[in-house]
């Protein structure tokens, strides 16, 4: 799968929550960032993530929400110079400081699911999705397309701002 173009086609600043309305939050600790899944009260500030959308070419036999051999991939950045990365070896989702061009581990295929929810499939390990495990984000293997609606890999985006890159 190759990404067409170096610049994102669009960007959204959104808060990320799980299917059952827990918030994905980020905390700086000892010069590294931790990712949490928390129950927040309505008046507690939700953390924001910048989602950068890229168009990618992919072989016709691959699944995804693309049309005409194109599909959407995203990178997720909660703070400047830090992006979510898939650590396929450890089955973990981590925040790492990176410079552009970003490594493939920072890209996720975006699947639009039912009820305004989305899921994020690892670019480097197809069939593996960002999911929730024990109040943390983890990489979760999904065996078949029927299991794509499993709740622990579904997320909701609450859009707060919309950037267009010209």
């Amino acid at each position: 799968m190759s990404i067409t173009g170096i610049s994102p086609i669009t960007e959204y600043l959104a808060s990320l929550s799980t299917y059952n309305d827990q918030s994905i939050t980020f905390a700086l600790e000892d010069e590294s960032y931790e990712i949490y899944v928390e129950d927040l009260k309505k008046d507690e500030k939700k953390d924001k993530v910048l989602l950068s959308y890229y168009e990618s070419q992919h072989p016709s036999n691959e699944s995804g929400d693309g049309v005409d051999g194109k599909m959407l991939m995203v990178t997720l950045s909660p703070t400047k110079d830090f992006w979510l990365h898939a650590n396929n070896k450890e089955h973990s989702v981590e925040l790492h400081k990176s410079e552009k061009p970003l490594p493939d581990q920072a890209f996720f295929v975006l699947h639009n699911m039912h009820s305004n929810s989305v899921s994020f499939e690892s670019k480097t390990d197809p069939g593996v999705f960002i999911g929730v495990k024990d109040n943390h984000l983890a990489l979760i293997k999904v065996d078949s397309s029927e299991n794509l609606s499993t709740e622990n890999i579904l997320f909701k985006l609450s859009e707060t701002h919309h950037h267009h890159h010209h």
Epitope: Y36, K42, K45
Partner: antibody, heavy 121, light 107 residues
């Protein structure tokens, strides 16, 4: 489920010291400020100490400043209140409470069950 | 410090009755007000925050309203478990301060 369990209350003589503890579970302790609140028997509630989520800053009213010290151990999900130079007017039930998340939201969403401190000779 | 004055201090009431507790602040607190219930065994529970937002799991018979310096807590139809002490708290300005409490008791 969020739980706060207070302990360490006892009967002590005036001028002595006592340390209270509060063990937290069911939430990410290090993301929240924490607070101690007390209630003199038959009276209202009084805020007595707060600590930021990292433990870097602490706040007290004049009534306990210089005598009481709030601290926390984020690795153990535990809040402490060190009380020195105790006076009879410190006799109260002491509650720990979860305060605001970093600096957003509203305070004291969850409370411990309280622990009774009696200062008497 | 901001002073909070609750009234009445005691509120005798009957099951099924609608009751309202008032909390007046010495200066404007911009809706930064919570309401707490304390049971006879000492257990404290937050009912409402941000003046009118009900905590999840709190029955809808409880409601909060107000602005500026005048706030209130209402219980639309009293149930037996509602006989307790109620406190307001302002968190607009440090130090956070509580009202002196209102005891809702059986008439």
């Amino acid at each position: 489920e969020v739980q706060l369990v207070d302990s360490g209350g006892d009967q002590v003589q005036p001028g002595r010291s006592l340390k209270l503890s509060c063990v937290a579970s069911g939430f990410i302790f290090k993301n929240y400020w924490m607070t101690w609140i007390r209630q003199v028997p038959g009276k209202g509630l009084e805020w007595i100490a707060s600590i930021t989520n990292s433990g870097g800053n602490t706040y007290y009213p004049d009534s306990v400043k210089g005598r009481f010290t709030i601290s926390r151990d984020n690795a153990k999900d535990t809040l402490y209140l060190q009380m020195n130079s105790l006076r009879s007017e410190d006799t109260a039930t002491y509650y720990c409470a979860r305060d605001r998340r970093y600096n957003s939201g509203s305070p004291f969403a969850y409370w411990g069950q309280g622990t009774l401190v009696t200062v008497s000779s | 410090d901001i002073q909070l004055t609750q009234s009445p201090s005691t509120l005798p009431a009957s099951l099924g009755e609608r009751v309202t507790i008032s909390c007046r602040t010495s200066q404007s607190i911009n809706n930064n007000l919570c309401w707490y219930q304390q049971k006879p065994d000492g257990t404290v529970k937050r009912l409402i925050y941000s003046t009118s937002t009900l905590e999840s799991g709190v029955p809808s018979r409880f409601s909060g309203s107000g602005s500026g310096t005048d706030y209130s807590l209402s219980i639309s139809s009293l149930e037996s478990q509602d006989f307790a002490m109620y406190y307001c708290l302002q968190y607009a300005t440090y130090p956070w301060t509580f009202g002196q409490g209102t005891k809702v008791e059986i008439k």
